[in-house]
Amino acid sequence: AGTPEVWVQVQMEATELSSFTVHCGFLGPGSISLVTVSWGGPDGAGGTKLAVLHPELGTRQWAPARQARWETQSSISLALEDSGASSPFANTTFCCKFASFPEGSWESCGSLPPSSDPGLSAPPTPVPILRADLAGILGLSGVLLFGCGYLLHLLRRQKHRPTPRLQPSHTNSQALTAQAWAPSQASQAALHDPYATINTSFCPATLDTAHPNGWASLPTHAAHQPQGPAASASTPILARGSFVSVENGLYTQAGERPPHTGPGLTLFPDCRGPRALEGRFGVR
């Protein structure tokens, strides 16, 4: 089935240079229970929430978000209005966190490329990532010099060797594309405090052993870990998705009934029903 992935694409509107749109999507078999979009970093790790979208309850958004909406059942868009003349969005990291069943929470971040042509970004396609040192060598000049043909050659060559795990790099801000692909790491969460901010996420795959008070019995094995972030096909990037902060990483009990769960079991961060997701309602 493969590891779930979250993609993030940031684009400047061709008509209004002060308008940006963040597109996020989830690639995985699970049922999405919540999407959180933040800027300045991951949600709960220095980032500031811009919008929260629930597939049934609606969406919530806060300035400078202008319109948050579901584009498909597994992707969302968030339009942003940049009131400042200096266009701060251009240098900002946007992160999308998808809570899904049974995979847990997955988060990726991306930003507008330094020299992006407005309105030209195409929805990304997941492919194996380029090695960070290779991407750094190529850089923007490499992209301009050798063009798409050389990129395709690199990607083709990359497919024939194992993908290394990429560590977060101080040069992450030099990403050359708005389409940052990076599945977040998932591992087992502690049961001690269901409301604590934790650095990992685990959603029990089998909730049939959930306790009456809403706790789920966690399996003893650790959750699978993704073997490496993936990059978009458009231009070489440096991985920016190896970091993740997940709040309320346990999902059980009540209300919505995603596929393959027993009656009364669902995906809500406070383990007690739809109450535990941060805000709702749609566009202003």
């Epitope: 049934e56 609606g58 919530r60 958004q61 535990a276 941060e278 749609g282």
Partner: antibody, heavy 114, light 113 residues
Framework: EVQLVQSGAEVKKPGSSVKVSCKAS????????IEWVRQAPGQGLEWIGE????????NYNEKFKGKATFTADTSTNTAYMELSSLRSEDTAVYYC???????WGQGTLVTVSS | DIVMTQSPDSLAVSLGERATINCKSS????????????LAWYQQKPGQPPKLLIY???TRESGVPDRFSGSGSGTDFTLTISSLQAEDVAVYYC?????????FGQGTKLEIK
């Protein structure tokens, strides 16, 4: 389970202000919106607005801009709504709510009377 | 703002009988992207805050008896109580959960005949 406990009833003079509090427990206070809803005697429900305590981001119903001001104190898990320039028509029960209006405070009756 | 209009304003139904409350929105509450309707139903008993019954037009909140059901799409929605119980006497509100600001219907008072 998340609980929202509001401050007690208030009787105020026209032109004065009142600050209603809403203390949350049992959840991550800074991660979810606190909504404020008004219900005048014998009337329906009106959304006043919301605050996201972690960032103090707010959304206001246009009707209540200038009338209501939201603040939040994450150290005490308490959200506040201040109503200014009170008039008799502001007499109502004011509710705080959260998590898609699934959790509600017990309500605070604010009576404006000379 | 989206205007929510409920009908009837009041309703008297015999115990064990079916009660139906309608709600009409001035704009569609259907999101075309994921084909979900953003409408919620609440029950409010005297002296109590409202209680969430239904969200997403048809999904019952945890702990809500299965005699309560929601249906509809777009601009027309219905709350049905299949077999009225004495404890169901209350005022029922529908609510737009699609667009800011969230707006409520004027309420329908349900009584026992």
């Amino acid at each position: 389970e998340v609980q929202l406990v509001q401050s007690g009833a208030e009787v105020k003079k026209p032109g004065s202000s009142v600050k209603v509090s809403c203390k949350a427990s049992g959840g991550t206070f800074s991660s979810f919106s606190i909504e404020w809803v008004r219900q005048a005697p014998g009337q329906g429900l009106e959304w006043i607005g919301e605050i996201l305590p972690g960032s103090n981001s707010t959304n206001y119903n246009e009707k209540f801009k200038g009338k209501a001001t939201f603040t939040a104190d994450t150290s005490t898990n308490t959200a506040y709504m201040e109503l200014s320039s009170l008039r008799s028509e502001d007499t109502a029960v004011y509710y705080c709510s959260s998590y898609w209006f699934a959790y509600w405070g017990q309500g605070t009756l604010v009576t404006v009377s000379s | 703002d989206i205007v929510m209009t409920q009908s009837p304003d009041s309703l008297a139904v015999s115990l064990g009988e079916r009660a139906t409350i309608n709600c009409k929105s001035s704009q569609s509450l259907l999101n075309s992207g994921n084909q979900k309707n953003y409408l919620a139903w609440y029950q409010q008993k005297p002296g109590q805050p409202p209680k969430l019954l239904i969200y997403g037009a048809s999904t019952r909140e945890s702990g809500v008896p299965d005699r309560f059901s929601g249906s509809g799409s777009g601009t027309d929605f219905t709350l049905t109580i299949s077999s009225l119980q004495a404890e169901d006497v209350a005022v029922y509100y529908c609510q737009n959960a699609h667009s800011y600001p969230p707006t409520f219907g004027q309420g329908t008072k349900l009584e026992i005949k």
